[in-house]
């Protein structure tokens, strides 16, 4: 049986043009599903907002490495995938669509609490 058949699929259609302050980030997700137009990083801020970022950008690669390192320091055994558990909020310049598909993304978490930017999200049934 395929695992987690009804897990949500998060897709990014454009990327933030701004470099987000690292201090505002809590976690990230890798988006790799072929049902999405492009591979992407979705940063999750401490305010639980989600921001699509270009995984080819050097700052994005540096940030996700830092988040990986921090995550291993703070909770070495907790790597979890929960695109569903993360709330999207406040519209920004980045579109984010949710569809239903198994294991579309992986979430990597670290710390908690503060301020930030978000994305527009649409639920597709």
């Amino acid at each position: 049986q395929p695992d987690a058949v009804n897990a949500p699929l998060t897709c990014c259609y454009s990327f933030t043009s701004k470099m987000i302050p690292m201090s505002r980030l809590e976690s990230y997700k890798r988006i790799t599903s072929s049902r999405c137009p492009k591979e992407a990083v979705v940063f999750v801020t401490k305010l639980k907002r989600e921001v699509c970022a270009d995984p080819k950008k050097e700052w994005v690669q540096t940030y996700i490495k830092n988040l990986d390192r921090n995550q291993m320091r703070s909770e070495p055994t907790t790597l979890f995938k929960t695109a569903s558990a993360l709330r999207s909020s406040a519209p920004l310049n980045v579109k984010l669509t949710r569809k239903s598909e198994a294991n579309a993304s992986t979430t990597f978490s670290t710390t908690t609490s503060s301020t930030s930017v978000g994305v527009t999200s649409v639920t597709v049934n």
């Epitope: 137009p37 591979e39 990986d68 291993m72």
Partner: antibody, heavy 117, light 107 residues
Framework: QVQLVQSGAEVKKPGSSVKVSCKAS????????MHWVRQAPGQGLEWIGR????????KFDPKFQGRATITADTSTSTAYMELSSLRSEDTAVYYC??????????WGQGTTVTVSS | DIQMTQSPSSLSASVGDRVTITCKAT??????LAWYQQKPGKAPKLLIS???SLETGVPSRFSGSGSGTDYTLTISSLQPEDFATYYC?????????FGGGTKVEIK
């Protein structure tokens, strides 16, 4: 659906070069990295290098630096890997694969390259 | 370069068995580990990325665990279609490197 289709098998002489192609459909190759991985008969997998088709930037395993060339033609959504100064140890199946994060979720079917005198 | 050591190199098991394959990196790879399944004459198939995240369509009998330098692939109840060779791969830093593979054979 993402599909990577590679060119056919090649038989080459030692010292010569081979160029293998990988045509992508179902994705814009400018949005990903295209990697090349090889597998000698009965052996494990070995990463050769990758290209960012959007700008032509490449990265190689030092073992292949200078002998492997990876290029991409975004107009035809095709990536190429050329290996020069071939020796018998280069006999292998060569795979292209996509992946911006360094792991490979879609693979070509493989191209067998035989180096023999 | 980060070296990946996979063990065992081969194992014999029966349908229904629980199978565990381990992979050890020469340095911390911060969960940036992928597992692949390869059948003879075919390209590898991605099973797991990020040490634990199962790819779409991969049966839930496959699971990944581990952290730091030590990682494990577990098949909870081996099925006939699972007889294959399995590879781990680190994607923490280039050059990306693979383990030597584990061939899972029928007992």
């Amino acid at each position: 659906q993402v599909q990577l289709v590679q060119s056919g098998a090649e038989v080459k002489k030692p010292g010569s070069s081979v160029k293998v192609s990988c045509k992508a459909s179902g994705l814009n190759i400018k949005d990903t990295y295209m990697h090349w991985v090889r597998q000698a008969p009965g052996q494990g997998l070995e990463w050769i290098g990758r290209i960012d088709p959007a700008n032509g930037n490449t990265k190689f395993d030092p073992k292949f630096q200078g002998r492997a060339t990876i290029t991409a033609d975004t107009s035809t959504s095709t990536a190429y890997m050329e290996l020069s100064s071939l020796r018998s140890e280069d006999t292998a199946v060569y795979y292209c694969a996509r992946g911006v994060f360094g792991f490979f979720d879609y693979w070509g079917q493989g191209t067998t390259v035989t180096v023999s005198s | 370069d980060i070296q990946m050591t996979q063990s065992p190199s081969s194992l014999s098991a029966s349908v229904g068995d629980r199978v565990t394959i381990t992979c050890k990196a020469t340095e911390d790879i911060y969960n940036r580990l992928a597992w692949y399944q390869q059948k003879p004459g075919k390209a590898p198939k991605l099973l797991i990325s990020g040490a634990t995240s199962l790819e779409t369509g991969v049966p839930s009998r496959f699971s990944g665990s581990g952290s730091g330098t030590d990682y494990t692939l577990t098949i909870s109840s081996l099925q006939p279609e699972d007889f294959a060779t399995y590879y781990c791969q680190q994607f923490w830093s280039a050059p990306y490197t693979f383990g030597g593979g584990t061939k899972v054979e029928i007992k």
